[in-house]
Interface confidence: low
């Protein structure tokens, strides 16, 4: 399937709107400092070419790669230097070292402005004057942000963000219509390109084979009606996809991605009986939607493991003729029949099942060998059974914000070497996990929380990998993709760290917390609990309690204060000392 | 698109060794899974070795592991295959093949391209 002209291509593929988008992110993606018009400006003379491309296919230049393409336009920047820095010297190198220098350059946690959003009439005013620039805008910012984000789906939100305008513009109450709807989609924004990020870290980090070791086992559990060739297919398909779209060749992933969702729809009969209501629907919601369908009932007579992969004498013939498949096939077989379980568990049952074949299949007699392998899955299952029950009562019986500092200080006490705001940021997302997943039925809870941990602390390790300072976290993040959690989860107090000196600074506050959302307040407040750990990591739970509880009276009585920055002056130096004494 | 040329075949007496290359023109390797596979007379082509893009990642066919080493040196587009200790069951025409999207590394159907194959020799 060779094409002339790539460029050509896939903008007849993909069409000039959707084109336009793609290219726009995929800028924005890579030079994350460049200014709106700069890229708008790089992204209309792409659209130009490819448009004399798609009249003469001939054309001079209309035969190079896209990465030679895009690649040649960013590097006309003329500010490619002062911004970047040493990005600039990727322009130096050949394709395909230009684009890995170009990746390797991504920055996860960009030194930009948070996005403040106007006030409602302002933007219903942008969006009907200019609704094309407004769409543009919203990609930009997202995409320079999230330089991960998956493309084909922020194509999708932005569908979204543009329907929400257009309906609630109109509406008697813009901001009851509107509000509601950009923080759905903000919430969801930060998830996808959180999950996304794992997806990438997989692939990059792990490579292909530890992706599709896992996308075998979510299909599995989607699929379970699906045979074990039909979801090998599919999980080709899809690595390919996520390959393009992690290596930021955004059309092809785009257009490989509506492929697939063709596909799917096409062959709903082998693959599910939940796909119907997503393929009715327009391309961009399509391919969502099945992303996110739900599990397929499993088949009601599938026959116990044990006869195939233990009782069976050809269990090591089977595993030496092709071990990979037959260990993908020992995947697919046991997440069908376990949606209750997560992705990580069913991984890392895998790996303990191979570990027994390695070491049985060379022993004197195989089968007495393996014939308990089973049993030794217990303690595996057992392990994030019990980690979901344990803090999904003590997230019952704190709350969110509660619960969100007990992690804190669990996480700080572990890596206290960690920045101060990514402890926060990780924390405050690990203790999400309650109110996301502790409402769900015991058949749910496993899965939910585990994977979304391990999405999480993907998190962790992507911020700690640009400016590493712990081994720990180092350990962690790159032994093992499957046991990252359970690795974290077994840290203990750092014994070795040097507490970290004490300063009043960081404890001295001032009347600007008061005008501060509820949000902002329990984040300054859970940064001052933080460094409280670093300066006190042997400090009780009841100490650090006594302490906080201090912190926010004292912030309360002030705020109600009429001379508010005079209370806090005069207040402020009060609490540190008490709280020094307190923790002494 | 990758053409790709093999070489390094003969013939050679048990136990001895030989090194074949997998020369790749058109494109670079980089982006692609590399793998060995072979067919002896009267068999089906199966499985040898393969290696992942960056090289962090070998596999191998139980028959052969301990004695084939795969490698690849992505600058000369270039992938090899050193074979010790080679025995008369060894003896089958060699093919390299590339594969954009493997998944499981040890089957034919997940690479698309093939070489025309280079053949060894193992008799006393």
């Known amino acids: 399937d060779t094409h002339k002209s790539e460029v050509a291509h896939r903008f007849k593929d993909l069409g000039e709107e959707h084109f336009k988008g793609l290219v726009l992110v995929a800028f924005s993606q890579y030079l994350q400092q460049c200014p709106f018009e700069e890229h708008v400006k790089l992204v209309n003379e792409v659209t130009e070419f490819a448009k004399t491309c798609v009249a003469d296919e001939s054309a001079e230049n209309c035969d190079k790669s896209l990465h030679t393409l895009f690649g040649d336009k960013l590097c006309t920047v003329a500010t490619l230097r002062e911004t970047y820095g040493e990005m600039a010297d990727c322009c130096a190198k050949q394709e395909p070292e230009r684009n890995e220098c170009f990746l390797q350059h991504k920055d996860d946690n960009p030194n930009l402005p948070p996005l403040v959003r106007p006030e409602v009439d302002v933007m219903c005013t942008a969006f009907h004057d200019n609704e094309a620039t407004f769409l543009k805008k919203y990609l930009y910012e997202v995409a320079r942000r999230h330089p991960y984000f998956y493309a084909p789906e922020l194509l999708f939100f932005a569908a979204r963000y543009k329907a929400a305008f257009a309906e609630c513009c109109q509406a008697a109450d813009k901001a009851a219509c509107l509000l509601p709807k950009l923080d759905e989609l903000r919430d969801e924004g930060k998830a996808s390109s959180a999950k996304q990020r794992l997806k990438c870290a997989s692939l990059q980090k792990f490579g292909d084979r530890a992706f599709k070791a896992w996308a075998v086992a979510r299909l599995s559990q989607k699929f379970p009606k699906a045979e074990f060739a039909e979801v090998s297919k599919l999980v080709t398909d899809l690595t390919k996809v996520h390959t393009e779209c992690c290596h930021g060749d955004l059309l092809e992933c785009a257009d490989d991605r509506a492929d697939l969702a063709k596909y799917m729809c096409e062959n709903q009969d082998s693959i599910s009986s939940k796909l119907k209501e997503c393929c009715d629907k327009p391309l961009l919601e399509k391919s969502h939607c099945l992303a996110e369908v739900e599990n397929d009932e499993m088949p009601a007579d599938l026959p116990s493991l044990a006869a195939d992969y233990v009782e069976s004498k050809d269990v090591c013939k089977n595993y030496a003729e092709a071990k990979d498949v037959f260990l993908g096939m020992f995947l697919y077989e046991y997440a069908r029949r376990h949606p209750d379980y997560s992705v990580m568990l069913l991984l890392r049952l895998a790996k303990a099942y191979e570990a027994t074949l390695e070491k049985c299949c060379a022993a004197a007699d195989p089968h007495e060998c393996y014939a308990k392998v089973f049993d030794e899955f217990q303690p595996l299952v057992e392990e994030p059974q019990n980690l979901v029950k344990q803090n999904c009562e003590l997230f019952e019986q704190l709350g969110e914000y509660k619960f969100q500092n007990a992690l804190l200080v669990r996480y700080t006490k572990k890596v206290p070497q960690v920045s101060t705001p990514t402890l926060v940021e990780v924390s405050r997302n690990l203790g999400k996990v309650g109110a996301k997943c502790c409402k769900l039925p015991e058949a749910k809870r496993m899965p939910c929380a585990e994977d979304y941990l391990s999405v999480v602390l993907n998190r962790l390790c992507v911020l700690h990998e640009k400016t590493p300072v712990s081994e720990k976290v180092t350990k962690c993040c790159t032994e093992s993709l499957v046991n990252r959690r359970p690795c974290f989860s077994a840290l203990e107090l750092d014994e070795a760290y040097v507490p970290k000196a004490f300063n009043a600074e960081t404890f001295t506050f001032h009347a600007d917390m008061c005008t501060l959302s509820e949000k902002e307040k329990q984040v300054k407040k859970q940064t001052a609990l933080v460094e409280l750990v670093k300066h006190k990591p042997k400090a009780t739970k009841e100490q650090l309690k006594g302490v906080m509880d201090n912190f926010a009276a004292f912030v309360e009585k002030c705020c109600k204060a009429d001379d508010k920055e005079a209370c806090f002056a005069e207040e402020g130096p009060k609490f540190v000392a008490a709280s020094q004494a307190a923790l002494a | 698109e990758v053409q790709l040329v093999e070489s390094g075949g003969g013939v050679v007496q048990p136990g001895g060794s030989l090194r074949l290359s997998c020369a790749a023109s058109?494109?670079?390797?980089?982006?692609?899974?590399m793998g060995w596979f072979r067919r002896a007379p009267g068999k089906e082509r199966e499985f040898v070795a393969a290696?992942?893009?960056?090289?962090?990642?070998?596999y191998y066919a139980d028959s052969v592991k301990g004695r084939f080493t795969i490698s690849r040196d992505n600058s000369k587009k270039t992938a090899y295959l050193q074979m010790n200790s080679l025995r008369p069951e060894d003896t089958a025409l060699y093919y390299c093949?590339?594969?954009?999207?493997?998944?499981?590394?040890?089957?034919?159907?997940?690479?698309?391209?093939w070489g025309q194959g280079t053949l060894v020799t193992v008799s006393s």
């Open positions: 290696i992942s893009r960056s090289g962090g990642y070998t």
């Open positions: 093949a590339a594969g954009r999207y493997s998944a499981w590394y040890s089957q034919s159907y997940e690479y698309d391209y």
């Open positions: 058109g494109s670079t390797i980089s982006s692609y899974v």
